[in-house]
């Protein structure tokens, strides 16, 4: 419906001139929700194009989007979050293309933050923790997180771990000794609400200890 893939990843859309994608973020600023749309064709001339949403709104029939560089944006408390809204691309009063979208099915969570990794010498493991603003939210509380890590020298060899909590333990023996690792995390709605992966958190970098030859164990840094 939105030009995104079912698995939460973006897909190459079959592009017509005005095909577009949108995502919602609920309670993104206190009790305010946001809706962000953009064209799928990077070459489309957006000069006179506007977006409008109608239906499934509280107290009003329609709302106009604000244009912010090349995205179209609404921040409001007026989303009903029940039923489908009609989102249209317009030039003047003329609608060029429209899509009916349930805003609860295009939710993009906020990116996780405060990612850190602590080495536990006695346990020979690494405890990965991160935070998410969604723990405090009323609506989108339940998320699936995707923790991805790689040895820094391995450009595209990411290992992914899915989890519902904000804490993960990585066993030292599963990692290379004396190596620099990059780790990052993203989130996707996992209960009632549907949608897309958040942006990745900022990456965190950590080094694994050397192997201690006498014991065969790694030395902490």
């Amino acid at each position: 419906e939105s030009g995104y893939a079912q698995n939460g990843d973006l897909e190459d859309a079959e592009l017509d001139d005005y095909s577009f994608s949108c995502y919602s973020q609920l309670e993104v600023n206190g009790s305010q929700h946001s809706l962000t749309c953009a064209f799928e064709d990077p070459d489309v001339n957006i000069t006179n194009l506007e977006f409008e949403i109608c239906g499934a709104l509280v107290e009003v029939k329609c709302l106009n989007f604000r244009k912010l560089q090349e995205i179209y944006f609404i921040e409001t408390k007026k989303f009903l979050l029940i039923g489908k809204s009609n989102i249209c691309v317009k030039v003047g009063e003329k609608s060029l293309t429209c899509k009916k979208i349930d805003l609860t099915t295009i939710v993009k969570p906020e990116a996780p933050f405060d990612l850190s990794v602590v080495y536990r010498e006695g346990a020979n493991d690494f405890v990965v923790t991160f935070n998410t603003s969604h723990l405090q939210k009323k609506y989108v509380k339940v998320l699936m997180h995707d923790v991805a890590y790689r040895q820094e020298k391995d450009e595209n060899k990411w290992t992914h771990v899915n989890l519902s909590s904000t804490k993960l333990t990585l066993l030292q023996r599963k990692l290379q000794p004396a190596a620099m690792y990059e780790i990052k995390v993203r989130s996707i709605p996992d209960h009632y609400f549907k949608g897309f992966w958040s942006e990745w958190s900022p990456s965190y970098y950590f080094r694994t200890p050397e192997i201690n030859n006498s014991s065969g164990e790694m030395d902490p840094i």
């Epitope: 859309a13 995502y23 990077p42 070459d43 912010l68 090349e70 942006e199």
Partner: nanobody
């Protein structure tokens, strides 16, 4: 102010691969469609590939279709160009910029395809 820093170019044999990176700063990267351009000596700068704001839409010049792939990482404010099956005619200085660019350009990165 806007800064665009391209990297990843080099000398490669025909049929080889390179991955170009462009680190952007000084503007809200995630609000713009981005593109790669190239300029060979004595020629006009040409559009190679473009990617939409969310990354789901991509367009390519006919000469690179099926060989080049543009992608973006909004968390890192970076746009990439994976170039496979390189040909001598791909030799040029490669630049990234907004699809609807301002006057500012980075220094570019030189790609030379030669045996």
């Amino acid at each position: 102010q806007v800064q665009l820093v391209e990297s990843g170019g080099g000398l490669v044999q025909p049929g080889g691969s390179l991955r170009l990176s462009c680190a952007a700063s000084g503007f809200t990267f995630s609000n713009y469609a981005m593109s790669w351009y190239r300029q060979a000596p004595g020629k006009e700068r040409e559009l190679v590939a473009s990617i939409s704001v969310f990354g789901g839409g991509t367009n390519y010049a006919d000469s690179v279709k099926g060989r080049f792939t543009i992608s973006r990482d909004n968390a890192k404010n970076t746009v990439y160009l994976q170039m496979n099956s390189l040909k001598p005619e791909d030799s040029a200085v490669y630049y990234c910029n907004k699809r609807r660019y301002d006057d500012y350009w980075g220094q570019g990165t030189q790609v030379t395809v030669s045996s």
